[in-house]
Interface confidence: low
C-alpha cells in the first residue's frame, strides 16, 4: 500500500485546514493508528494528535479544541484531521505516520501554508491644489502573507511607486499615487486595488479626488456697448468664474464708490435706470480658500442725444 496526501495545503487565516492522509492498501489491510506531528526543521516533532482505530482521537494539550476528525461518514483507512481556525503560527511542515497491519508503518509530509489576507488602508495625501507640481494624491498600504499586490485603478493620469517591508511572517506593501493636480480631476475616483491569493476577489478602496482651483474671472454684460445708454433699465454685469471650493464674489468701482442704487447680488451687479454717473471702471473680485482673481471692465453710458448730434455733424461736414 501507499499513503496519499498533498505536498502543500493552503488555507486562509481563520479557516479550517484539512490535513489529508489516506492509506490506499491492499485487500484485508487495516490501519491501526495515525499519528500527526509538526516537524519544522530544527524544532523536533511536536505531537498534534493520535487517531486510534479502537480508542478514537487523542489530542495533545497544545492543540486541545483545535484538532478534530472530519465529519462522518469516515473511511477506516482515512487518517485525515481538521486543524480548526488556522493562524499564521500554524504555518509549517506536518507529518502523518500510519501504522498498518500487516504491512507496517508509512509516513508522509505536507506543508501547511496559511494565507493572511491583507487589510488595506488608503491614506489621502495633502490637500490638492491646481498649480502644484507632482503631488502625492494617496498612499495605499496592505500587509499580508505572502506579500500582496497593490495597484491603482483610475482614469486620472499619474505615476505610482511601491515599496515593501518584510516582517517575520508577512510583508507590508505601500504604493503611492502621485499626480499633477488639475481641476478636471475633481470628483474622479482613485481606487487602490489589492490582490492576494487569500482573497476571493480583489479588495478595492476608493478615494474621490478633491482639487482646489479658481478659474480666471471675466465679466459678461458689455457685449453690446450700444445698450448702455441713458435711461436703460435692467442693465447688469455678471462675473463669471468657477472654483473649488465654490468662490465668493465682491464688486467695487475703481474710480470711486459704487453709485447709489446699484445692487450687488453675489456674482451680479444690477443697475438702476442708467445715468452718466454709472460710467466708470468696475472690478469683480472672485475668491475662495485657494486663490483670488480680479476682472475689470469699463462702463461708458452713452447719451443718445449726443450721439445723434454727432451724426448730424458728420453729415453736415460731408
Amino acid at each position: 500500500g501507499e499513503l496519499e496526501t498533498s505536498d502543500v495545503v493552503t488555507v486562509v487565516l481563520g479557516q479550517d485546514a484539512k490535513l489529508p492522509c489516506f492509506y490506499r492498501g491492499d485487500s484485508g489491510e487495516q490501519v491501526g493508528q495515525v499519528a500527526w506531528a509538526r516537524v519544522d526543521a530544527g524544532e523536533g516533532a511536536q505531537e498534534l494528535a493520535l487517531l486510534h482505530s479502537k480508542y478514537g482521537l487523542h489530542v495533545s494539550p497544545a492543540y486541545e479544541g483545535r484538532v478534530e476528525q472530519p465529519p462522518p461518514p469516515r473511511n477506516p483507512l482515512d487518517g485525515s484531521v481538521l486543524l480548526r481556525n488556522a493562524v499564521q503560527a500554524d504555518e509549517g511542515e506536518y507529518e502523518c505516520r500510519v501504522s498498518t497491519f500487516p504491512a507496517g508503518s508509512f509516513q508522509a509530509r505536507l506543508r501547511l501554508r496559511v494565507l493572511v489576507p491583507p487589510l488595506p488602508s488608503l491614506n489621502p495625501g495633502p490637500a490638492l491644489e491646481e498649480g502644484q507640481g507632482l503631488t502625492l494624491a494617496a498612499s495605499c498600504t496592505a500587509e499580508g502573507s505572502p506579500a500582496p499586490s497593490v495597484t491603482w485603478d483610475t482614469e486620472v493620469k499619474g505615476t505610482t511607486s511601491s515599496r515593501s517591508f518584510k516582517h517575520s511572517r508577512s510583508a507590508a506593501v505601500t504604493s503611492e499615487f502621485h499626480l499633477v493636480p488639475s481641476r478636471s480631476m475633481n470628483g474622479q475616483p482613485l481606487t487602490c486595488v489589492v490582490s492576494h491569493p487569500g482573497l476571493l476577489q480583489d479588495q478595492r478602496i476608493t478615494h474621490i479626488l478633491h482639487v482646489s482651483f479658481l478659474a480666471e474671472a471675466s465679466v459678461r454684460g458689455l457685449e453690446d456697448q450700444n445698450l448702455w445708454h441713458i435711461g436703460r433699465e435692467g442693465a447688469m454685469l455678471k462675473c463669471l468664474s468657477e472654483g473649488q471650493p465654490p468662490p465668493s464674489y465682491n464688486w467695487t468701482r475703481l474710480d470711486g464708490p459704487l453709485p447709489s442704487g446699484v445692487r450687488v447680488d453675489g456674482d451680479t451687479l444690477g443697475f438702476p435706470p442708467l445715468t452718466t454717473e454709472h460710467s466708470g471702471i468696475y472690478v469683480c473680485h472672485v475668491s475662495n480658500e485657494f486663490s483670488s482673481r480680479d476682472s475689470q471692465v469699463t462702463v461708458d453710458v452713452l447719451d443718445p442725444q449726443e450721439d445723434s448730434g454727432k451724426q448730424v455733424d458728420l453729415v453736415s461736414a460731408s
Partner: antibody, heavy 121, light 107 residues
C-alpha cells in the same frame, strides 16, 4: 467607544441660517472623514457632503452648493454644518456620520443621534 | 446622479421568516453597496458594506450579495428586533445616494 454627539433641536425662520455641531470622541478625529446626511420627516436619507477634518477639505452635493458650509475645530474634535437661506423644505433631522476606516469615502460606520431643524414662519 | 431603487417599499413578515430586500442601481457600481438599518427616532446603523461584508457586531443572520447593478440583503431568520426600515446606499461616486427604504413590519 466611538461617539458622535450633536447639538440640540433648532427652530428657524425661513431665510435664516442654522449651524449644527457634532462632537467626536473615542477615536482620532482627524483620521476619518465626517459626512452630513439629512432626513426629512417620513422621508429617506439624503447625503449633503463631507469634510476631511485633517485638511478641512470639503465635498458638497451639488444640490447644497452655495448654501452649505462644513467646518471643523480640531482642538475640540468638533465638526460643524451650516445651512443658509433656509426654506420650509429644509425641515429635517440632520445627522453627522463618520466615514469608516476602510471606506472613508462612502461607508458610514458611526452616526450622531441627529438634530431636528424645523423651519417655520 | 446614480439612482438607487429598492423593492419592495414595505413588507410584512413574521418572526423566523426569511426576508429578502433588493436594491437596483441605475448604473454599475461594482461592489460599492452598503446596507443600513433604521428604527423609528434613531440614527441608521451600518449592517453590510462592500455588498457582502458584515460590519463588526452585526448578527450573522444578515447577509448581502450582488455586484454591478443588482444587490440583495437577506435576513435568514427574522427576529423581533429586526422590524425596522432598511436602506441601501451606493459609495461608487458622489453624490452618495440612498434607496428610498424598505419598511419591514410585523405580520
Amino acid at each position: 467607544e466611538v461617539q458622535l454627539v450633536q447639538s440640540g433641536a433648532e427652530v428657524k425662520k425661513p431665510g435664516s441660517s442654522v449651524k449644527v455641531s457634532c462632537k467626536a470622541s473615542g477615536y482620532t478625529f482627524t483620521g476619518y472623514y465626517m459626512h452630513w446626511v439629512r432626513q426629512a420627516p417620513g422621508q429617506g436619507l439624503e447625503w449633503m457632503g463631507w469634510i476631511n477634518p485633517n485638511s478641512g477639505g470639503t465635498n458638497y452635493a451639488q444640490k447644497f452648493q452655495g448654501r452649505v458650509t462644513m467646518t471643523r475645530d480640531t482642538s475640540i474634535s468638533t465638526a460643524y454644518m451650516e445651512l443658509r437661506s433656509l426654506r420650509s423644505d429644509d425641515t429635517a433631522v440632520y445627522y453627522c456620520a463618520r466615514g469608516s476606516a476602510l471606506h472613508f469615502f462612502g461607508v458610514f460606520d458611526y452616526w450622531g443621534q441627529g438634530t431636528l431643524v424645523t423651519v417655520s414662519s | 446622479d446614480i439612482v438607487m431603487t429598492q423593492s419592495p417599499s414595505s413588507l410584512s413578515a413574521s418572526v423566523g421568516d426569511r426576508v429578502t430586500i433588493t436594491c437596483r442601481a441605475s448604473q454599475s457600481i461594482s461592489s460599492y453597496l452598503n446596507w443600513y438599518q433604521q428604527k423609528p427616532g434613531k440614527a441608521p446603523k451600518l449592517l453590510i458594506y462592500a455588498a457582502s461584508s458584515l460590519q463588526s457586531g452585526v448578527p450573522s443572520r444578515f447577509s448581502g450579495s450582488g455586484s454591478g447593478t443588482d444587490f440583495t440583503l437577506t435576513i435568514s431568520s427574522l427576529q423581533p428586533e429586526d422590524f425596522a426600515t432598511y436602506y441601501c446606499q451606493q459609495s461608487y461616486s458622489t453624490p452618495l445616494t440612498f434607496g428610498q427604504g424598505t419598511k419591514v413590519e410585523i405580520k
